[in-house]
């Protein structure tokens, strides 16, 4: 079945969600009017026919984009530095795991299209988030909306990873 995502990858993803939750600085109840439809490409994570290359590519691009988003001067000014450092470290570890897996999957001949297409879609999605933050002048509420949006999209992506893992288990036991 090719590269198995390291067993602790799912744990790292959950830790990232926990960290994002802990990073909350203001009550989201103050920010209702700042909600925005970022149009997360749900079709990318909802399919039942999950290819390993696709799943890994989506997760890799998601984590890369989250890392970039939270690795800026603006982000450093907005968040608790201790939690931000922990987030960076966790994301870096996950990215290393995924890069190893992606190289192996590509080496096994899975289509490059399965890898490049999600990346482009996700870059557009994250660009929309960056534009929103700039429009809102990087306000506390804008960052809070973005934090919750990232938690949602990461949660959906992690679910996709879990579905792939359980599919692999089913195939392995049959």
């Amino acid at each position: 079945l090719g590269c198995d995502l390291p067993q602790n990858h799912g744990l790292l993803s959950r830790n990232t969600l926990v960290l994002l939750h802990q990073m909350r600085r203001i009550s989201p109840f103050l920010c209702l009017k700042d909600r925005r439809d970022f149009r997360f490409p749900q079709e990318m994570v909802k399919g039942s026919q999950l290819q390993k290359a696709h799943v890994m590519s989506v997760l890799h691009e998601m984590l890369q984009q989250i890392f970039s988003l939270f690795h800026t001067e603006r982000s450093s000014a907005a968040w608790n530095m201790t939690l931000l450092d922990q987030l960076h470290t966790g994301l870096h570890q996950q990215l290393q795991h995924l890069e190893t897996c992606l190289l192996q999957v590509v080496g096994e001949g899975e289509s490059a299209g399965a890898i490049s297409s999600p990346a482009l879609t996700l870059r557009r999605y994250f660009q929309g988030i960056r534009v929103y933050l700039k429009e809102k002048k990087y306000s506390d509420c804008a960052w809070e909306v973005v934090r919750m949006e990232i938690m949602k999209s990461l949660f959906l992506s992690t679910n996709m990873q879990e579905r792939l893992r359980s599919k692999d288990r089913d195939l392995g036991s049959s």
Epitope: L32, K33, D37, F38, M148, K152
Partner: antibody, heavy 121, light 107 residues
Framework: EVQLVQSGAEVKKPGESLKISCKGS????????IGWVRQMPGKGLEWMGI????????AYSPSFQGQVTISADKSISTAYLQWSSLKASDTAMYYC??????????????WGQGTLVTVSS | DIQMTQSPSSLSASVGDRVTITCRAS??????LNWYQQKPGKAPKLLIY???SLQSGVPSRFSGSGSGTDFTLTISSLQPEDFATYYC?????????FGQGTKVEIK
């Protein structure tokens, strides 16, 4: 299948305390807020307050602040609405409903079946 | 608090009629407006969110429009099951507030 199941009807006397519940299933309970809405007999809908079950942060309508307490136990995916001293004017149907928080999604897309609270001496 | 005013408070119509209900906010709520349908003894049901987005599973005869302070719910061709009370609700800011309701009755 997403469901919000509320506790059964209650008949109470003025001055008594009460806690009604709303149990969520079929979705990630901590990813949505839970709101409470009152409907007095023959009247319209009134928003009472809301809770974020992930950390129990709450917001109340000024009309209900200090009159009721909203809480949640995320370990059992349940939100609560409670009164320490009921009044006859609390007689109403109470609904819970889920809210997507700051995420862009339909507001109050799923509702509980309602809990009828009757307060009478 | 943001006040929501619905009109009319009740209306009589026949099956097949086009029905329009309006909702006015006391200040701009941009597009943060929802419409609900409630039948006697039942919980409210979400029809339209974000002023014009049709909730999944809701028939396309229901539509919503408007932004800022003035909003409209339209039922293009009233069906027997549409006789109910309709509420608008703003979700622009806390406290969330509902309109007083519009009862749609059979003529």
């Amino acid at each position: 299948e997403v469901q919000l199941v509320q506790s059964g009807a209650e008949v109470k006397k003025p001055g008594e305390s009460l806690k009604i519940s709303c149990k969520g299933s079929g979705y990630s309970f901590t990813s949505y807020w839970i709101g409470w809405v009152r409907q007095m007999p023959g009247k319209g809908l009134e928003w009472m307050g809301i809770i974020d079950p992930s950390d129990s942060d709450t917001a109340y309508s000024p009309s209900f602040q200090g009159q009721v307490t909203i809480s949640a136990d995320k370990s059992i995916s349940t939100a609560y609405l409670q009164w320490s001293s009921l009044k006859a004017s609390d007689t109403a149907m109470y609904y819970c409903a889920r809210h997507p928080g700051l995420n862009w999604a339909p507001d109050f897309d799923y509702w509980g079946q309602g809990t009828l609270v009757t307060v009478s001496s | 608090d943001i006040q929501m005013t619905q009109s009319p408070s009740s209306l009589s119509a026949s099956v097949g009629d086009r029905v329009t209900i309006t909702c006015r906010a006391s200040q701009s709520i941009t597009g943060f407006l929802n419409w609900y349908q409630q039948k006697p003894g039942k919980a409210p049901k979400l029809l339209i969110y974000a002023a014009s987005s049709l909730q999944s599973g809701v028939p396309s005869r229901f539509s919503g429009s408007g932004s800022g302070t003035d909003f409209t719910l339209t039922i293009s061709s009233l069906q027997p099951e549409d006789f109910a009370t309709y509420y608008c609700q703003q979700s622009h800011d806390f406290p969330l507030t509902f309109g007083q309701g519009t009862k749609v009755e059979i003529k």
